[in-house]
Amino acid sequence: DVERTTCPPEKEVHEIDESLIFYKKRELEACVDAALLAAQMDRVDAIPFTYEQLDVLKHKLDELYPQGYPESVIRHLGHLFLKMSPEDIRKWNVTSLETLKALLKVSKGHEMSAQVATLIDRVVVGRGQLDKDTVDTLTAFCPGCLCSLSPERLSSVPPSVIGAVRPQDLDTCGPRQLDVLYPKARLAFQNMSGSEYFVKIRPFLGGAPTEDVKALSQQNVSMDLATFMKLRREAVLPLTVAEVQKLLGPHVEGLKVEEQHSPVRDWILKQRQDDLDTLGLGLQGGIPNGYLILDLSVREALS
C-alpha cells in the first residue's frame, strides 16, 4: 500500500489531465481526490499512466467505493479494467451493454477470461435475463463468451433468443451448459423442416437425450463425426449399429480413425462384433458372437 503523505501545495490536483503522468506514486496518492477521479473517469483512459500509477488510481476508487463501483465509473474504466480482479467485479451492478462493449474491447488480447466471465455474469444479473441484445453483444464482441456463463445463468435465456447464437459461440460450452441450452433450441427451431432443423440444432446436440438422437437417425441427416463425438456418452451408448450407420451416413467410415476416443470407444465395446463387421471398417472390440449379455444392474434394482 502507498504511504500516506501530505500533498505539496504546488502539486494540488484540480482536474485529471496529462500532467499527472509526472507524479510519483505517493504524490498521486496524496494529491488526487477520489471523488474528483470518479467524476472525471472519462479522461483517465486518454492519459498514458504507468501500470504502477493505475494501481494507485484503483486504490483510490476502492477506498471511495468499498461496496463496488457505480456504473458511471465502470463505463469509463478503460485500461484500468485490466487491474480488476474477479472479486472486484463481483461487487458491481452493470446493466448497460455500452459498458459491457467498452470493457470487452479493453480486455481483448489480455488474459482476462475469469474477469470477463464475471463481468458477463454481472450484466446478466443486472439485466434480469440473458436477452437478445446481450447475446448479440456477446457474439459480436466476445465469441465463445456465452459458454463462460454458468448453467444457472444460461437458464434465463428465452428460447426466442437462441436463433441469434452461432455455432462458434458454443464451441467451448461444456455438457452441463448444453443440457440447459438444448431444450431451448429444440423449442426455438421446432417449426423448421428436417434438413433446416438439423443445421440449426446441430451446435446444441451435445445436450440431446438418446431418444432425440435416435429420432435424428431416422431423418437421413448425415451427421459429421465431430458433432457425433460431442454427443453425451449416455446418449450414444444405447444406439445400435444400424442407428449409428443411419445417423452418420457416409461419415460412419470415420469411426475407424476415432475408435480410441470417447464416446466411440465406449460405444464399440457395447456392440456385437458381427454387427460392427457390417460397417466394413475392421473395427475390433465388440462383444464376441455367441456371448450373452446380462445387465446385473436391473437384477439389483429388483431385489
Epitope: S222, D224, M229, K230, L279, G280
Partner: antibody, heavy 115, light 113 residues
Framework: QVQLQQPGTELVKPGASVKLSCKAS????????MHWVKQRPGQGLEWIGS????????YYNEKFKNKATLTVDKSSSTAYMQLSSLTSDDSAVYYC????????WGTGTTVTVSS | DIVMTQSPSSLTVSVGQKVTMSCKSS????????????LAWYQQKPGQSPKLLVY???TRESGVPDRFIGSGSGTDFTLIISSVQAEDLADYFC?????????FGGGTKLEII
Amino acid sequence: QVQLQQPGTELVKPGASVKLSCKASDYTFTSYWMHWVKQRPGQGLEWIGSINPSNGDTYYNEKFKNKATLTVDKSSSTAYMQLSSLTSDDSAVYYCARGWYFDVWGTGTTVTVSS
Amino acid sequence: DIVMTQSPSSLTVSVGQKVTMSCKSSQSLLNSSSQKNYLAWYQQKPGQSPKLLVYFASTRESGVPDRFIGSGSGTDFTLIISSVQAEDLADYFCQQHYSTPRTFGGGTKLEII
C-alpha cells in the same frame, strides 16, 4: 504390398455406358471402404462417391448421383463403377482409392468418350 | 459443400530450397473432441496416381520423407518441403474429409529449375 489395379483405358461412344473395375489385393477387402475420384485435365480432383464393401451401402456426391453406380464383388475383391449416358464431359481419368484418408490409390483408368 | 482453396497455383524453385504451400477451408476441419484436423495432402507426379503424404493435417504417412511437413488447424493449413529434391516435381493437393462430399483444393504445381 497393397494394390488397387485398374484397366488403363476405355474408349466408349457418346450415350453408351461403361463399367470400370478396381481389383484389390493384399488386404482384407471388407475392412476398408472404397472411394472413386474423377480427374479431368486441368480441373483437379472430384469425389464421386464411396461404397462399404461389407454390406454394399453406397454414398454419392449429389453431382454424380445420376451418373455413377457403385458396386462390389466380395468374392473377387473387386469394386466397380458404372458410368451411364456418357458425354464428352465424362472423358477423364477415374481412380479408386481406399479408406478414410485415401491411403492407397488405384492405377487409374482413362475414359475417352468419342464417336 | 466445404470449399478448399490452395495457393499459389504454381511455384518454381531450385533444388535445396524450402517451399511453402497453403490450403484454406471454408469452414473449420477440427474435431475438437479428438483434436484432429480432417485434412490430407497428396502428391501427384506427372503421369502417376496421387499418393498420400500427410493426414490429420500433420501426421506423415509411413515411408514419406521427413522433409514433408504438414501443419495448421481449423481453416488454415500449410505443407512445407524443407529442402526440395528433383523428385518432388509434382502437383500437390489438399483434401478435407470432415464432411461429404469430400472436396479437394485446386492444387499447387511445383516446378524445379
